[in-house]
Protein backbone atom coordinates (compact mmCIF):
# COMPACT_ATOMS: atom_id res chain seq x y z
CA UNK A 1 0.00 0.00 0.00
CA UNK A 2 3.23 2.51 0.87
CA UNK A 3 4.40 1.14 -1.78
CA UNK A 4 2.00 2.31 -4.00
CA UNK A 5 0.90 5.52 -2.56
CA UNK A 6 4.14 6.48 -3.65
CA UNK A 7 3.78 5.63 -7.24
CA UNK A 8 0.61 7.43 -7.32
CA UNK A 9 2.64 10.67 -5.58
CA UNK A 10 5.47 10.17 -8.35
CA UNK A 11 3.58 9.78 -11.25
CA UNK A 12 1.35 13.07 -10.46
CA UNK A 13 4.58 14.90 -10.33
CA UNK A 14 6.03 13.71 -13.38
CA UNK A 15 2.36 14.62 -15.34
CA UNK A 16 3.09 18.47 -13.40
CA UNK A 17 6.79 18.62 -14.48
CA UNK A 18 5.28 16.94 -18.13
CA UNK A 19 4.15 20.42 -19.26
CA UNK A 20 7.60 22.46 -18.75
CA UNK A 21 9.64 19.28 -19.40
CA UNK A 22 8.72 16.73 -22.22
CA UNK A 23 10.92 14.27 -20.75
CA UNK A 24 12.68 13.36 -17.90
CA UNK A 25 15.55 11.45 -17.19
CA UNK A 26 15.60 10.02 -14.03
CA UNK A 27 17.85 7.96 -11.98
CA UNK A 28 17.05 6.14 -8.12
CA UNK A 29 18.96 7.64 -5.72
CA UNK A 30 18.60 7.90 -1.64
CA UNK A 31 19.80 5.77 0.94
CA UNK A 32 16.95 3.13 0.01
CA UNK A 33 17.02 3.87 -3.75
CA UNK A 34 13.48 5.04 -3.47
CA UNK A 35 13.88 8.85 -4.35
CA UNK A 36 14.15 9.56 -7.98
CA UNK A 37 16.28 12.97 -9.22
CA UNK A 38 15.82 14.27 -12.88
CA UNK A 39 16.93 16.03 -15.21
CA UNK A 40 14.78 17.17 -18.65
CA UNK A 41 16.43 15.17 -21.54
CA UNK A 42 18.88 15.78 -23.19
CA UNK A 43 20.82 17.77 -20.08
CA UNK A 44 23.19 16.03 -17.96
CA UNK A 45 23.69 16.03 -14.28
CA UNK A 46 26.24 16.17 -12.00
CA UNK A 47 26.02 16.11 -8.33
CA UNK A 48 22.84 18.50 -7.48
CA UNK A 49 22.11 20.50 -10.53
CA UNK A 50 21.57 19.62 -14.42
CA UNK A 51 23.36 21.41 -17.22
CA UNK A 52 22.73 21.60 -21.01
CA UNK A 53 24.98 23.43 -23.64
CA UNK A 54 23.09 25.69 -25.61
CA UNK A 55 24.93 26.17 -29.34
CA UNK A 56 22.94 28.88 -30.55
CA UNK A 57 24.96 32.05 -30.54
CA UNK A 58 23.47 35.05 -28.42
CA UNK A 59 24.33 37.61 -26.59
CA UNK A 60 24.75 37.18 -22.66
CA UNK A 61 21.21 38.79 -21.48
CA UNK A 62 19.60 36.85 -24.46
CA UNK A 63 21.48 33.50 -23.47
CA UNK A 64 20.13 34.31 -19.52
CA UNK A 65 16.84 34.99 -20.49
CA UNK A 66 17.12 31.26 -22.70
CA UNK A 67 17.79 29.83 -19.42
CA UNK A 68 15.66 31.59 -17.81
CA UNK A 69 12.40 30.60 -20.01
CA UNK A 70 13.74 26.70 -19.25
CA UNK A 71 13.57 27.30 -15.78
CA UNK A 72 17.70 27.49 -15.23
CA UNK A 73 20.08 30.22 -15.07
CA UNK A 74 23.44 30.30 -16.91
CA UNK A 75 25.98 28.13 -15.02
CA UNK A 76 27.25 29.04 -12.02
CA UNK A 77 30.79 27.61 -11.22
CA UNK A 78 31.04 26.23 -7.81
CA UNK A 79 33.98 23.91 -7.29
CA UNK A 80 37.02 23.01 -9.57
CA UNK A 81 35.23 19.25 -10.34
CA UNK A 82 32.12 21.24 -11.69
CA UNK A 83 34.20 22.97 -13.76
CA UNK A 84 35.60 19.33 -15.02
CA UNK A 85 32.47 18.14 -15.25
CA UNK A 86 31.08 20.70 -17.46
CA UNK A 87 33.76 21.14 -19.89
CA UNK A 88 34.05 17.67 -20.52
CA UNK A 89 31.34 18.46 -22.95
CA UNK A 90 32.38 21.40 -24.49
CA UNK A 91 34.36 21.77 -27.85
CA UNK A 92 37.65 23.45 -27.61
CA UNK A 93 37.37 25.72 -30.07
CA UNK A 94 34.26 27.51 -28.61
CA UNK A 95 33.41 29.93 -25.96
CA UNK A 96 30.56 29.48 -23.70
CA UNK A 97 28.80 32.11 -21.36
CA UNK A 98 28.95 31.83 -17.63
CA UNK A 99 26.00 33.16 -15.36
CA UNK A 100 29.17 35.68 -14.38
CA UNK A 101 28.91 39.47 -15.24
CA UNK A 102 30.19 43.15 -14.24
CA UNK A 103 27.10 45.12 -15.22
CA UNK A 104 29.06 48.55 -14.23
CA UNK A 105 32.84 47.92 -15.22
CA UNK A 106 33.90 47.85 -11.60
CA UNK A 107 35.15 44.74 -11.22
CA UNK A 108 32.60 44.42 -8.95
CA UNK A 109 31.43 40.29 -10.43
CA UNK A 110 28.27 38.86 -9.61
CA UNK A 111 26.67 35.64 -10.22
CA UNK A 112 23.02 35.62 -11.79
CA UNK A 113 21.69 33.50 -9.01
CA UNK A 114 23.48 35.90 -6.09
CA UNK A 115 25.67 33.38 -4.95
CA UNK A 116 28.62 35.39 -3.97
CA UNK A 117 31.63 36.07 -5.63
CA UNK A 118 34.75 34.37 -4.03
CA UNK A 119 37.83 35.40 -5.28
CA UNK A 120 39.72 31.97 -3.98
CA UNK A 121 37.19 30.00 -6.06
CA UNK A 122 37.78 31.53 -9.61
CA UNK A 123 39.31 29.98 -12.86
CA UNK A 124 40.70 33.06 -14.70
CA UNK A 125 42.81 32.23 -17.33
CA UNK A 126 46.34 34.27 -16.50
CA UNK A 127 45.80 38.15 -17.17
CA UNK A 128 41.82 37.73 -16.81
CA UNK A 129 39.67 39.46 -16.47
CA UNK A 130 41.56 42.48 -18.44
CA UNK A 131 39.25 45.28 -19.73
CA UNK A 132 36.21 47.24 -17.93
CA UNK A 133 34.40 47.22 -21.22
CA UNK A 134 34.41 43.52 -21.30
CA UNK A 135 32.16 42.75 -18.84
CA UNK A 136 30.54 39.28 -19.59
CA UNK A 137 32.60 36.04 -18.68
CA UNK A 138 32.87 32.80 -20.73
CA UNK A 139 34.63 29.89 -20.26
CA UNK A 140 37.08 28.55 -23.46
CA UNK A 141 39.91 26.68 -23.82
CA UNK A 142 43.17 28.37 -23.65
CA UNK A 143 47.06 27.51 -23.30
CA UNK A 144 46.05 23.70 -22.48
CA UNK A 145 43.81 24.57 -19.93
CA UNK A 146 40.29 25.45 -19.84
CA UNK A 147 39.63 28.56 -18.03
CA UNK A 148 37.24 32.27 -18.04
CA UNK A 149 37.67 35.31 -19.83
CA UNK A 150 35.83 38.22 -19.53
CA UNK A 151 33.91 39.22 -22.98
CA UNK A 152 31.92 42.13 -24.32
CA UNK A 153 27.82 41.12 -23.42
CA UNK A 154 26.84 41.97 -26.86
CA UNK A 155 28.84 39.46 -29.15
CA UNK A 156 26.86 36.29 -29.36
CA UNK A 157 28.62 33.46 -28.01
CA UNK A 158 27.36 29.41 -26.94
CA UNK A 159 25.95 28.83 -22.96
CA UNK A 160 25.72 26.80 -20.83
CA UNK A 161 22.28 26.53 -18.29
CA UNK A 162 22.35 24.75 -15.03
CA UNK A 163 18.97 23.93 -12.89
CA UNK A 164 18.54 22.17 -9.72
CA UNK A 165 17.87 18.67 -10.12
CA UNK A 166 14.06 18.03 -10.07
CA UNK A 167 13.43 14.76 -6.87
CA UNK A 168 10.23 13.10 -7.01
CA UNK B 1 38.24 68.16 -26.15
CA UNK B 2 37.35 65.00 -27.88
CA UNK B 3 36.75 65.31 -31.83
CA UNK B 4 36.95 63.07 -34.44
CA UNK B 5 37.89 63.95 -37.98
CA UNK B 6 37.30 61.86 -40.76
CA UNK B 7 38.99 61.90 -44.35
CA UNK B 8 39.02 59.85 -47.54
CA UNK B 9 35.50 60.04 -49.04
CA UNK B 10 35.15 61.08 -52.78
CA UNK B 11 33.52 59.78 -56.07
CA UNK B 12 34.02 56.67 -57.12
CA UNK B 13 32.82 53.97 -59.93
CA UNK B 14 31.10 50.88 -58.99
CA UNK B 15 33.66 47.88 -58.01
CA UNK B 16 36.38 50.46 -56.91
CA UNK B 17 38.06 51.21 -53.06
CA UNK B 18 38.46 53.53 -51.25
CA UNK B 19 39.81 53.73 -47.76
CA UNK B 20 38.25 56.26 -44.97
CA UNK B 21 40.40 57.30 -42.38
CA UNK B 22 39.27 59.41 -38.81
CA UNK B 23 42.02 60.75 -36.65
CA UNK B 24 40.91 60.85 -32.83
CA UNK B 25 42.06 63.66 -30.26
CA UNK B 26 41.58 64.45 -27.25
CA UNK B 27 41.10 61.22 -25.13
CA UNK B 28 43.06 57.86 -24.63
CA UNK B 29 41.97 56.20 -28.29
CA UNK B 30 43.63 52.70 -27.24
CA UNK B 31 40.85 52.47 -24.52
CA UNK B 32 37.29 52.83 -26.42
CA UNK B 33 35.67 51.06 -29.38
CA UNK B 34 35.12 52.49 -32.18
CA UNK B 35 32.55 52.26 -35.09
CA UNK B 36 31.46 53.40 -38.58
CA UNK B 37 28.07 54.65 -38.93
CA UNK B 38 26.47 55.72 -42.62
CA UNK B 39 23.64 57.57 -43.68
CA UNK B 40 22.44 57.29 -47.31
CA UNK B 41 21.02 60.98 -48.52
CA UNK B 42 17.43 61.48 -46.80
CA UNK B 43 17.62 58.51 -44.93
CA UNK B 44 18.63 56.90 -41.18
CA UNK B 45 22.02 55.97 -39.49
CA UNK B 46 23.06 52.66 -40.41
CA UNK B 47 25.98 50.92 -38.44
CA UNK B 48 28.70 49.76 -40.82
CA UNK B 49 31.55 48.44 -38.26
CA UNK B 50 32.49 47.87 -35.28
CA UNK B 51 36.20 47.21 -33.44
CA UNK B 52 37.16 46.70 -29.90
CA UNK B 53 39.52 48.83 -28.07
CA UNK B 54 42.42 45.96 -28.34
CA UNK B 55 41.29 45.61 -31.83
CA UNK B 56 40.49 41.90 -30.57
CA UNK B 57 36.57 42.19 -32.17
CA UNK B 58 35.35 43.22 -35.43
CA UNK B 59 31.69 43.12 -36.73
CA UNK B 60 29.87 43.78 -39.79
CA UNK B 61 26.68 43.37 -41.34
CA UNK B 62 25.55 41.30 -43.87
CA UNK B 63 25.65 44.04 -46.47
CA UNK B 64 29.37 45.07 -46.08
CA UNK B 65 30.51 41.73 -44.63
CA UNK B 66 33.57 40.29 -47.17
CA UNK B 67 33.90 43.65 -48.96
CA UNK B 68 34.70 46.45 -46.19
CA UNK B 69 37.40 45.74 -43.48
CA UNK B 70 37.45 48.05 -40.22
CA UNK B 71 41.25 48.69 -38.62
CA UNK B 72 42.70 50.84 -36.04
CA UNK B 73 46.17 52.26 -35.18
CA UNK B 74 46.08 53.13 -31.28
CA UNK B 75 50.07 54.90 -31.74
CA UNK B 76 48.77 56.83 -34.16
CA UNK B 77 45.12 57.55 -32.90
CA UNK B 78 43.44 56.73 -35.80
CA UNK B 79 40.73 54.57 -37.63
CA UNK B 80 40.28 53.06 -40.67
CA UNK B 81 37.40 51.50 -43.05
CA UNK B 82 39.14 50.01 -46.05
CA UNK B 83 35.71 49.68 -48.77
CA UNK B 84 36.57 47.13 -51.54
CA UNK B 85 33.47 46.27 -54.20
CA UNK B 86 31.90 49.43 -54.03
CA UNK B 87 28.24 49.56 -54.88
CA UNK B 88 25.83 52.82 -55.78
CA UNK B 89 24.01 51.91 -52.47
CA UNK B 90 27.45 52.38 -50.54
CA UNK B 91 26.62 55.90 -51.14
CA UNK B 92 26.18 57.96 -47.55
CA UNK B 93 28.18 60.07 -45.31
CA UNK B 94 30.19 58.09 -43.44
CA UNK B 95 30.62 59.05 -39.58
CA UNK B 96 33.19 57.61 -37.03
CA UNK B 97 31.77 56.85 -33.46
CA UNK B 98 33.16 56.86 -30.09
CA UNK B 99 31.78 53.82 -28.27
CA UNK B 100 30.81 54.25 -24.56
CA UNK B 101 30.01 51.04 -22.81
CA UNK B 102 26.48 51.44 -20.22
CA UNK B 103 26.01 47.89 -18.49
CA UNK B 104 25.46 45.13 -21.13
CA UNK B 105 25.54 47.40 -24.35
CA UNK B 106 26.76 50.72 -25.68
CA UNK B 107 26.28 54.38 -26.69
CA UNK B 108 28.02 56.69 -29.30
CA UNK B 109 28.49 59.22 -27.42
CA UNK B 110 30.90 61.28 -30.19
CA UNK B 111 30.62 61.38 -33.39
CA UNK B 112 32.62 63.23 -36.17
CA UNK B 113 31.37 65.66 -38.82
CA UNK B 114 31.44 62.71 -41.64
CA UNK B 115 33.28 62.19 -45.17
CA UNK B 116 30.57 61.79 -48.15
CA UNK B 117 31.51 58.30 -50.51
CA UNK B 118 29.40 58.56 -53.63
CA UNK B 119 29.33 55.69 -55.73
CA UNK B 120 28.42 56.18 -59.35
CA UNK B 121 30.05 55.77 -62.98
CA UNK C 1 18.34 41.54 -35.70
CA UNK C 2 16.60 43.73 -33.55
CA UNK C 3 13.89 46.16 -35.33
CA UNK C 4 13.41 49.49 -33.89
CA UNK C 5 10.15 51.10 -35.07
CA UNK C 6 9.77 54.88 -34.20
CA UNK C 7 6.66 56.53 -34.64
CA UNK C 8 5.19 59.27 -35.51
CA UNK C 9 7.68 59.39 -38.50
CA UNK C 10 7.04 63.88 -38.75
CA UNK C 11 5.24 65.47 -36.03
CA UNK C 12 4.56 69.54 -36.05
CA UNK C 13 5.11 70.95 -32.86
CA UNK C 14 4.14 74.93 -31.39
CA UNK C 15 6.50 76.15 -29.08
CA UNK C 16 5.75 75.61 -25.60
CA UNK C 17 4.10 72.45 -26.29
CA UNK C 18 5.40 68.98 -25.36
CA UNK C 19 6.29 66.58 -28.17
CA UNK C 20 6.34 62.43 -27.96
CA UNK C 21 8.29 60.18 -29.95
CA UNK C 22 7.95 56.55 -29.23
CA UNK C 23 10.33 53.51 -30.11
CA UNK C 24 9.16 49.88 -30.10
CA UNK C 25 11.33 47.20 -30.08
CA UNK C 26 11.18 43.69 -31.82
CA UNK C 27 12.28 41.85 -28.58
CA UNK C 28 13.10 43.14 -25.07
CA UNK C 29 16.03 45.18 -24.89
CA UNK C 30 16.12 45.21 -20.74
CA UNK C 31 17.81 43.14 -18.46
CA UNK C 32 16.88 43.37 -15.24
CA UNK C 33 17.16 47.35 -14.23
CA UNK C 34 19.09 47.99 -17.19
CA UNK C 35 17.36 49.34 -19.88
CA UNK C 36 19.29 49.58 -23.05
CA UNK C 37 17.97 52.48 -25.42
CA UNK C 38 19.31 55.41 -26.35
CA UNK C 39 18.56 58.70 -27.72
CA UNK C 40 20.25 60.82 -30.37
CA UNK C 41 19.44 64.09 -32.19
CA UNK C 42 20.73 65.58 -35.61
CA UNK C 43 20.06 68.67 -37.08
CA UNK C 44 20.42 69.55 -40.52
CA UNK C 45 24.13 69.08 -42.38
CA UNK C 46 25.46 68.04 -38.67
CA UNK C 47 26.16 64.96 -36.97
CA UNK C 48 23.79 62.76 -34.49
CA UNK C 49 24.02 64.02 -30.64
CA UNK C 50 23.67 61.72 -27.88
CA UNK C 51 20.78 62.85 -26.11
CA UNK C 52 19.92 59.89 -23.58
CA UNK C 53 21.34 56.72 -22.81
CA UNK C 54 19.87 53.86 -20.89
CA UNK C 55 16.53 54.99 -21.53
CA UNK C 56 15.91 57.76 -18.88
CA UNK C 57 20.07 59.02 -18.38
CA UNK C 58 20.18 63.07 -19.82
CA UNK C 59 24.03 63.32 -21.46
CA UNK C 60 25.81 66.10 -19.87
CA UNK C 61 25.18 69.32 -21.17
CA UNK C 62 21.81 68.55 -22.89
CA UNK C 63 18.60 70.69 -22.01
CA UNK C 64 16.77 69.21 -19.31
CA UNK C 65 13.28 69.45 -21.55
CA UNK C 66 14.84 66.33 -23.06
CA UNK C 67 13.52 62.88 -20.59
CA UNK C 68 13.27 59.39 -21.83
CA UNK C 69 11.39 56.79 -20.22
CA UNK C 70 10.41 53.38 -20.89
CA UNK C 71 11.69 49.54 -20.35
CA UNK C 72 11.36 45.94 -22.31
CA UNK C 73 10.23 47.11 -25.69
CA UNK C 74 8.20 50.35 -25.56
CA UNK C 75 10.92 53.25 -24.97
CA UNK C 76 9.08 57.57 -25.24
CA UNK C 77 11.64 60.48 -25.78
CA UNK C 78 10.05 63.28 -24.78
CA UNK C 79 10.66 67.19 -25.26
CA UNK C 80 8.58 69.86 -22.60
CA UNK C 81 8.34 72.76 -23.38
CA UNK C 82 9.34 72.43 -27.37
CA UNK C 83 12.10 75.38 -28.39
CA UNK C 84 12.33 76.31 -31.97
CA UNK C 85 16.07 74.81 -32.13
CA UNK C 86 15.03 71.51 -31.35
CA UNK C 87 13.91 71.25 -34.96
CA UNK C 88 15.27 67.43 -35.49
CA UNK C 89 15.94 64.20 -36.76
CA UNK C 90 15.57 62.00 -33.58
CA UNK C 91 16.59 58.15 -33.98
CA UNK C 92 16.23 55.87 -31.10
CA UNK C 93 19.15 52.94 -30.99
CA UNK C 94 20.12 49.51 -28.73
CA UNK C 95 23.21 47.78 -29.07
CA UNK C 96 22.21 44.66 -26.15
CA UNK C 97 23.21 42.24 -29.06
CA UNK C 98 25.32 42.73 -32.01
CA UNK C 99 24.19 44.21 -34.65
CA UNK C 100 23.57 47.53 -33.14
CA UNK C 101 20.14 49.27 -35.06
CA UNK C 102 18.74 52.65 -34.85
CA UNK C 103 15.17 53.37 -35.67
CA UNK C 104 14.03 55.05 -39.00
CA UNK C 105 13.76 58.11 -37.36
CA UNK C 106 11.05 60.82 -36.35
CA UNK C 107 11.44 64.31 -38.15
CA UNK C 108 10.06 66.64 -35.00
CA UNK C 109 9.41 70.32 -37.37
CA UNK C 110 8.00 73.66 -35.05
CA UNK C 111 5.09 75.25 -36.19
Known amino acids: NFMYSKTVKRLSKLQEYQQYYPSLTCVMEGKDMEDWSCCPTPWTSFQSSCYFISTVMQSWTKSQNNCSVMGADLVVINTKEEQDFITQNLKINSAYFLGLSDPKGWRHWQWVDQTPYNKNVTFWHSGEPNSPDERCAIINFRSEEWGWNDVHCHVPQKSICKMKKIYI | EVQLVESGGGLVKPGGSLRLSCAASGFTFSSYGMSWVRQAPGKGLEWVST????????YYPDSVKGRFTISRDNAKNSLYLQMNSLRAEDTAVYYCARQIYYDYAYYFDFWGQGTTVTVSS | DIVLTQSPASLAVSPGQRATITCRASESVSFRTSHLMHWYQQKPGQPPKLLIYGASNLESGVPARFSGSGSETDFTLTINPVEAEDTANYYCQQSIEDPPTFGGGTKVEIK
Open chain 2, 51 to 58: ISSGDSYT
